[in-house]
């Protein structure tokens, strides 16, 4: 004799008006806007012998629906119309012929808030389970994308930055990824839940914002993560850092992937300026300044990439008069000084007169 399931009759809240018709489903489910949820559901219905071989049709209705007039939000009956606003998003994932009424909701929207009840039909046997009902709560999307930077960002070296939304569900509408950066970038491959940005940073990109924006078009909701670029020359072994964005600068709404286009002359001038500044620092501070830099990780760490929390912008203060930058070969003393100070650009800010051109590219 097959295993008989009578225990569900004892489940709290599972009894409808007729104890031989019972349904078990959680009475409340919460889902973030744009995301998805699968609500397990089991039901039982006595089947008179004359309906034994009839197909089982299941329906989920919004609370207050009139069966003869209103369309369900989801059903397994192929020729049955469903509510336009839930079409393709609400799905009766369970097989009612196996007593499974599980409901799948993808691309959750605010207007999905409310209570829903299940109905079964098998031949002439029809029953609406008015208790328990499923209450759906759609809340703000609080999840944020993660930006993964493998190793250290060095000037002139291309790196693949990955923006991922591992918390998004496979069944939903694939999100649209948008990147914003002033640094020279191009788009790499993307998967359902991640996008790759190929970035070739310049010294002046240090401290600038990079934003990954993810739009869940199915629900019309957007989330983003902004980090500050840490561009440094590090000859040591690279490390991998994940920037979750806590305290890494203000969140900004950006429209797309931005490529910074800077004229070649501007780049040359900027590099010359950098060399001048280095030369001036070396001359002024000598070893004392270098040793101080080594000992203060919170301002100018000489190795590795600082976490965004500990980054502080240091302005380089030089004399008002112009220093001589003739491009002569560095002296041994300068080499030695540079060895201590290391070539890092923590204190560098993009020149104010540098014109940055923004262009938009989206990955879909």
């Amino acid at each position: 004799m097959p295993l008989l399931l009578l225990l569900p009759l004892l489940w709290a809240g599972a009894l409808a008006m007729d104890p031989n018709f019972w349904l078990q489903v959680q009475e409340s489910v919460t889902v973030q806007e744009g995301l998805c949820v699968l609500v397990p559901c089991t039901f039982f219905h006595p089947i008179p012998y004359y309906d034994k071989n009839s197909p089982v049709h299941g329906y989920w209705f919004r609370e207050g629906a009139i069966i003869s007039r209103d369309s369900p939000v989801a059903t397994n009956k192929l020729d049955q119309e469903v509510q336009e606003e839930t079409q393709g998003r609400f799905r009766l994932l369970g097989d009612p012929s196996r007593n499974n009424c599980s409901l799948s909701i993808v691309d959750a929207r605010r207007r999905d808030n409310g209570s829903y009840f299940f109905r079964m039909e098998r031949g002439s046997t029809k029953y609406s389970y008015k208790s328990p009902q499923l209450s759906v709560h759609v809340t703000d999307l609080t999840h944020r994308p993660k930006i993964l930077i493998p190793g250290t960002l060095e000037p002139g070296h291309s790196k693949n930055l990955t923006c991922s939304v591992s918390w998004a569900c496979e069944q939903g509408t694939p999100p649209i990824f948008s990147w914003l950066s002033a640094a020279p970038t191009s788009l790499g491959p993307r998967t359902t839940h991640s996008s790759v940005l190929i970035i070739t940073p310049r010294p002046q990109d240090h401290g600038t914002n990079l934003t990954c924006q993810v739009k869940f078009a199915g629900a019309g909701v957007t989330t983003e993560r902004t980090i500050q670029l840490n561009v440094t020359y590090v000859p040591q072994n690279p490390t991998t850092g994940i920037f979750p964005g806590d305290g890494s600068g203000k969140q900004e709404t950006r429209a797309g992937v931005v490529h910074g286009a800077i004229g070649g002359a501007g780049v040359t001038a900027l590099l010359a300026l950098c060399l001048c500044l280095i030369f001036f620092i070396v001359k002024t501070h000598r070893r004392k300044a270098a040793r101080t830099a080594v000992g203060r990780n919170d301002t100018h760490p000489t190795t590795g990439s600082a976490s965004p929390k500990h980054q502080k912008k240091s302005k380089l203060h030089g004399p008002t008069e112009t220093s001589s930058c003739s491009g002569a070969a560095p002296t041994v003393e300068m080499d030695e000084e540079l060895h201590y100070a290391s070539l890092n650009f923590h204190g560098m800010n993009p020149s104010k007169d540098t014109s940055t051109e923004y262009s938009e590219v989206r990955t879909q």
Partner: antibody, heavy 129, light 107 residues
């Protein structure tokens, strides 16, 4: 909990017809077959037939075909059994009983177990000249 | 039609006794067999369905077993309220048919 309440006792002459009612209260009426079972004095139980309260469809034992008519009134949750061309051997207590599939196994091959779990109190029909 | 045969037709026993009633089907009915209890002047009451599953509210001293053509109803320890007539019924194919009944009397 559902209850089945039947009409009162009847005395009929041979050749006449009798119509017994069975009213459901306190539960779902339409989703269960309603059976009619009779029991002659001192005898065992004899199944007569069933009615589908939703569609009005019926089936009856061959012995009663052509003589028994089962109908329903969904507005009052009542089913009726009419037996015509009465004979003395039709003297019996007539019961209506709800037939439910009482259990189900999980899996693709579901097994149903039918049993008459709710009965009316019975209606005595006496056929006498 | 499937014929159902019960034995014995009547049985005398005392309170506390263990009683067994058997039912035989004229063909294989798997486990689609029900047992009913009927007291004088009352409607039958479903005790067991599916050959061995106790209906809700029925005392556990009642048990059923069997499959195919041979079935048994057992009352482990007779109580005064158990003296009644017991019927088996096949619910395998139409028409539903009953056994002729077993009358359980006080010895």
């Amino acid at each position: 909990q559902v209850q089945l309440v039947q009409s009162g006792a009847e005395v009929k002459k041979p050749g006449a017809s009798v119509k017994v009612s069975c009213k459901a209260s306190g539960g779902t009426f339409s989703n269960y077959a309603i059976n009619w079972v009779r029991q002659a004095p001192g005898q065992g139980l004899e199944w007569m037939g069933w009615i589908n309260p939703n569609s009005g469809g019926t089936d009856s034992a061959q012995k009663f075909q052509g003589r028994v008519t089962m109908t329903r009134d969904t507005s009052t949750s009542t089913v009726y059994m009419e037996l015509s061309s009465l004979r003395s051997e039709d003297t019996a207590v007539y019961y209506c009983a709800r037939d439910s599939s009482l259990a189900l196994s999980y899996g693709g091959n579901s097994e149903y177990y039918y049993g008459m779990d709710v009965w009316g109190q019975g209606t005595t029909v006496t056929v006498s000249s | 039609d499937i014929q159902m045969t019960q034995s014995p037709s009547s049985l005398s026993a005392s309170v506390g006794d263990r009683v067994t009633i058997t039912c035989q089907a004229s063909q294989d009915i798997s486990d689609h067999l029900n047992w009913y209890q009927q007291k004088p002047g009352k409607a039958p009451k479903l005790l067991i369905y599916g050959a061995s599953t106790l209906q809700s509210g029925v005392p556990s001293r009642f048990s059923g077993s069997g499959s195919g053509t041979d079935f048994t109803l057992t009352i482990s320890s007779l109580q005064p309220e158990d003296f009644a007539t017991y019927y088996c019924q096949q619910a395998y194919s139409f028409p539903w048919t009953f056994g002729q009944g077993t009358k359980l009397e006080i010895k």
